[in-house]
């Protein structure tokens, strides 16, 4: 299973649920669905309040039980380490795959943390991060921001990923903006 890691803003906008959580239990495989279930302890929710309701608590995250069909494998054995998890809701359950954005909270830049906490949501409605994977690539719309990190750095951990968000500048126009300047 291969997929291009998304810009964190894309991950935020395309996910039903974005939370901070610790992986606390041994994974279990469901004998009916063939999904693997990880027990988690949610510490923060950044997106999904409407979908879940205010009192909701996510206790498990689900993923296919085999790598070749994009199952997510959690490598960390540190049960106190917090992870940012951006996933999809299916029948009220949080699902993730290899292609989902799952990252140690401590590995995120301060700008990314700010993005997940409050800024990425501003760009979800109108703006689109548009991946540039090969030259030439050009903007197809004024609401697109060209994402060139992978082209220039060969990595999703480039400057645009770590420090910028694609946000509305004016109606019909989105531009890369520094998340540093978004401090309230």
């Amino acid at each position: 299973c291969t997929c291009v890691p998304p810009h964190p803003q894309t991950a935020f906008c395309n996910s039903d649920l974005v939370i901070r959580a610790k992986f606390v239990g041994t994974p279990e495989v469901n004998q009916t669905t063939l999904y693997q279930r990880y027990e988690i302890k949610m510490t923060k929710m950044y997106k999904g309040f409407q979908a879940l309701g205010d009192a909701a608590d996510i206790r498990f995250v689900y993923t296919p039980a085999m790598e070749s069909v994009c199952g997510y494998f959690h490598r960390s054995h540190n049960r106190s380490e917090e992870f940012l998890i951006a996933g999809k809701l299916q029948d009220g359950l949080l699902h993730i795959t290899t292609c989902s954005f799952v990252a140690p909270w401590n590995s995120l830049s301060l700008a990314q943390r700010r993005g997940f906490t409050k800024t990425y949501t501003v760009g979800c409605e109108e703006c689109t991060v548009f991946p540039c994977l090969s030259i030439p690539c050009k903007l197809q719309s004024g609401t697109h921001c060209l994402w060139t990190d992978q082209l220039l750095q060969g990595s999703e951990k480039g400057f645009q990923s770590r420090h910028l968000a694609c946000l509305p500048r004016e109606p019909g126009l989105c531009t890369w903006q520094s998340l540093r300047s978004q401090i309230a």
Epitope: T32, L34, P64, M66, F73
Partner: antibody, heavy 113, light 111 residues
């Protein structure tokens, strides 16, 4: 009682195709993932393929990926394995299993010219 | 391509206890509590004897027990009987290969 009965095995030439069936009874078929496991003559067990209860998730061993297709018909309580581009090394007794707790008696597939 | 390592053969006299080991890695045996053991008599289908490391299905004699330490699982048969003579296979869940088996162990009951 819980029962699985395989059928469809036989002699086939290399490059040929065969479709195995597994008729299930005695339990709620759609509530269980099912698997195919094979055993070459005088050898050990090898997992081949698996399918979730609703047929949404499907897994294959690398040795059969792209050649074998697993499917199920929950209305008929039947599991299938479509085997294409068969090779001599696919010769084995093929068992269907409910998850891995109940097994059928197996059906022999021989690939030979 | 055998994923889990079992001794090719073990033997014991009636009434004795024997143990069959099954060694994997932290990615299979060591990483999950999904180890099963099967008994297979010649020309017959495998029969589940132990699941989830140490659980016995109903109808299986309590002379059969399972355990796990690190990356190695074990099947112990106490009070060995003639009908225990068979091949025994261990199996484990593995995230990459889904389900992996050991190469099998031939148990011979002496005498």
């Amino acid at each position: 009682q819980v029962q699985l009965v395989e059928s469809g095995g036989g002699l086939v030439q290399p490059g040929g195709s065969l479709r195995l069936s597994c008729a299930a009874s005695g339990f709620t078929f759609s509530s269980y993932a099912m698997s195919w496991v094979r055993q070459a003559p005088g050898k050990g067990l090898e997992w081949v393929s698996g399918i979730s209860g609703n047929g949404v998730l499907i897994f294959y061993a690398d040795s059969v990926k792209g050649r074998f297709t697993i499917s199920r018909d929950n209305s008929k309580n039947t599991l299938y394995l479509q085997m294409n581009s068969l090779r001599a090394e696919d010769t084995a007794v093929y068992y269907c299993a409910r998850w891995f707790d109940v097994w059928g008696q197996g059906t022999l597939v021989t690939v030979s010219s | 391509d055998i994923a889990l390592t079992q001794p090719a053969s073990v033997s014991g006299s009636p009434g004795q206890s024997i143990t069959i080991s099954c060694t994997g890695t932290s990615s299979d045996v060591g990483g999950y509590n999904y180890v099963s053991w099967y008994q297979q008599h010649p020309g017959k289908a495998p029969k589940l004897m132990i699941y989830d490391v140490s659980n016995r299905p109903s109808g299986v004699s309590n002379r059969f027990s399972g355990s796990k330490s690190g990356n190695t699982a074990s099947l112990t048969i106490s009070g060995l009987q003639a009908e225990d003579e068979a091949d025994y296979y261990c199996q484990s869940y593995d995230f990459v290969r889904f389900m992996v088996f050991g190469g099998g162990t031939k148990l011979t009951v002496l005498g």
